[in-house]
Interface confidence: low
């Protein structure tokens, strides 16, 4: 069964800067990745970035840099300023659309006891939805 993992890290240098890393553990080819915050997209979440393997990357503020790390994982840097600063308990969700598995989504947030710059190794997060 495919799985999605989500890792959230606060940068040590900037307390309002977050890095979100997401990966897809499946055999299919990824056709689209959508990253949102505040909950799953379509369930009250706000889209931060959309990554398409051929057609490129589109970000919505406050996403600063979204990129592919591997063929099946992405990273997104968030740069907060005032109103757009994520707080420690903000939920970030990643949705991977792949063929032939379909859409798989998982969410994660900053570990409660994490120090800036430190985070646990990425582990699969609970799968919220498979379309």
């Amino acid at each position: 069964t495919p799985e999605v993992w989500v890792q959230v890290r606060m940068e040590a240098t900037e307390l309002s800067s977050f890095t979100i890393r997401c990966g897809f553990l499946g055999s299919g080819s990824i056709s689209l990745v959508t990253v949102s915050w505040g909950g799953p997209n379509g369930a009250g979440g706000t889209t931060l970035a959309v990554l398409h393997p051929e057609r490129g990357i589109r970000q919505w503020a406050p996403a600063r840099q979204a990129r592919w790390e591997t063929q099946s994982s992405i990273s997104l840097i968030l740069e907060g300023s005032g109103a757009s600063s994520p707080c420690a308990n903000t939920t970030f969700c990643c949705k991977f659309a792949s063929f032939p598995e379909g859409s798989w989504e998982a969410c994660g947030s900053l570990p409660p006891s994490s120090d800036p710059g430190l985070s646990a190794p990425p582990t699969p997060a609970p799968i919220l939805r498979a379309d």
């Epitope: 889209t47 959309v50 589109r58 919505w60 600063r64 005032g82 109103a83």
Partner: antibody, heavy 123, light 106 residues
Amino acid sequence: QVQLVQSGAEVKKPGSSVKVSCKASGGTFSSYAISWVRQAPGQGLEWMGGIIPISGTANYAQKFQGRVTITADESTSTAYMELSSLRSEDTAVYYCARDTGRGYTRHFWFDPWGQGTLVTVSS
Amino acid sequence: DIQMTQSPSSLSASVGDRVTITCRASQSISSYLNWYQQKPGKAPKLLIYAASSLQSGVPSRFSGSGSGTDFTLTISSLQPEDFATYYCQQSDILYTFGGGTKVEIK
């Protein structure tokens, strides 16, 4: 140079819905976002929401959440804005605009804009 | 939501005048601010993006400055074609427009 051409003026009854289209030509449609902005007579500009066509992913202003639906058809390079449960206060000119950014920055702005579509809600 | 407050809401000026319009954000938005010009019956036109970057094709008499919560649009020498309404827009998180400033002929 990208151009956005919107559908024509509409007159609607209170309680009904309206669907306005915005067709892009002369440039890449899918990888940009298209936003919708409205302007009531003699009033200012109000952002309603926007969509990234390659994903069909839309974001909405809180005020319009649940009443507006923004969609896009990549095959025709057309974005749509549907507003339901219309009331007289929804009488306005509705604009679409390409939500443009530069490289890996967080700076986004609207350029170009469609010519606007007047929606009149009247019984 | 981030609120954007423009002042003044209207002003009267003469050709050749230096005109300043201010925009204040309810919270810090860094430099994520754009300025638009709108003439009656027309769609808005982008003038300045990222607080101070002049859009291609816009005359150099337009300039923008500021960061954080306070921003300014300046027209160094008002021309007849500049009589219009000007709007600021924050793009820090989604979008909000200011209420507009109408520049009229004195």
